[in-house]
Amino acid sequence: YDFTNCDFEKIKAAYLSTISKDLITYMSGTKSTEFNNTVSCSNRPHCLTEIQSLTFNPTAGCASLAKEMFAMKTKAALAIWCPGYSETQINATQAMKKARKSKVTTNKCLEQVSQLQGLWRRFNRPLLKQQ
């Protein structure tokens, strides 16, 4: 999906008001210095592409984050403010949610959510030069 035409300011507002808090809750008890940020993004559409991938695509050691509150809210924001955000992707998320039996917070998942926090912070500061 091409995130170019999303309403970035409304997605940013949703992140600041609620998604960010859910990410913090998920990471509670973890030191902010525990994980290095290895995933980066260069502009808002790119950031959303990376956020979508890390949030909804299963990775080794972290089967799926799709059932977490921050993920459901991310999906809702993209569905509302990204025109034509594909039903295929929305339905794929539902399949992932059904496939997941239990919510186990592994160290790999914590690392992944730490990367997500970095991507969201970058999304909120689009004018900053890439390090």
């Epitope: 949703a14 008001s17 039903e87 929305i90």
Partner: antibody
């Protein structure tokens, strides 16, 4: 069973405001969006805006921006729509409608019975 | 953005088929597969009949079907019955600002 129950008929003077409520029951309030749609006498349907309880955000049609406010009280699973600076053209039946599940907010699979609002001096 | 165009009225005899068209633009109907159809009897709330172009909610008769070609969506009702007499509205997702646009409505008369 799943239903939306709306508040009763209203008669208002031009310039006044009106608030219509919509009580949800029989389904998980936070999993859906609630939209408001109006229908003037003998006319078609017009989408006004929606509220997504999961995010706590609203989205309004440009035509109604600044004049409509949609709010929710999750504790009572009630959504309200307030329309201000009423004029005679606002005379219509106002419906609340539930956006489809699984984030498919653009179609409406459950409707309230409608609340007639008359604006007359 | 303006409302998609529907014929004001169509008619058919019991047992026949009718098709109601809904013509929009590339910014709404042509741009997304997010088209729904609603049936409304006089004095009643609308009822969802078709969503996402051609999907039927549970409980809706398979006599109702939807399709799309370019900027035009269509609702076909086969084997017309007396209770099908109603107004029919198409609706399309129309981007993040307008979000949903309804067509002007079509009155179906069973003759």
């Amino acid at each position: 069973q799943e239903q939306l129950v709306q508040s009763g008929d209203e008669v208002k003077k031009p310039g006044a405001s009106v608030k219509v409520s919509c009580k949800s029951s029989g389904f998980t309030f936070g999993s859906y969006a609630i939209s408001w749609v109006r229908q003037a006498p003998g006319q078609g349907l017009e989408w006004m805006g929606m509220l997504v309880p999961l995010l706590g955000v609203t989205n309004y049609a440009e035509k109604f921006q600044g004049r409509v406010t949609i709010t929710a009280d999750p504790s009572t699973t009630t959504t309200s729509m307030e329309l201000s600076s009423l004029r005679s053209e606002d005379t219509a039946v106002y419906y609340c409608a539930r956006g489809g599940s699984n984030y498919l907010y653009w179609y409406f699979d459950l409707w309230g019975p409608g609340t007639p609002i008359t604006v007359s001096s | 953005q303006s409302a998609p165009i529907q014929p004001r009225s169509v008619s058919g005899s019991p047992g026949q088929s009718v098709t109601i068209s809904c013509t929009g633009t590339s910014s709404d109907i042509g741009g997304y597969n997010r088209i729904s159809w609603y049936q409304q009897h006089p004095g009643k709330a609308p009822k969802l009949m078709i969503y996402d172009v051609s999907k039927r909610p549970s409980g809706v008769s398979d006599r109702f079907s939807g399709s799309k070609s370019g900027n035009t969506a269509s609702l076909t009702i086969s084997g017309l019955q007396a209770e099908d007499e109603a107004d029919y509205y198409c609706s399309s997702y129309a981007g993040t600002d307008t979000f949903v646009l309804f067509g002007g409505g079509t009155q179906l008369t069973i003759v």
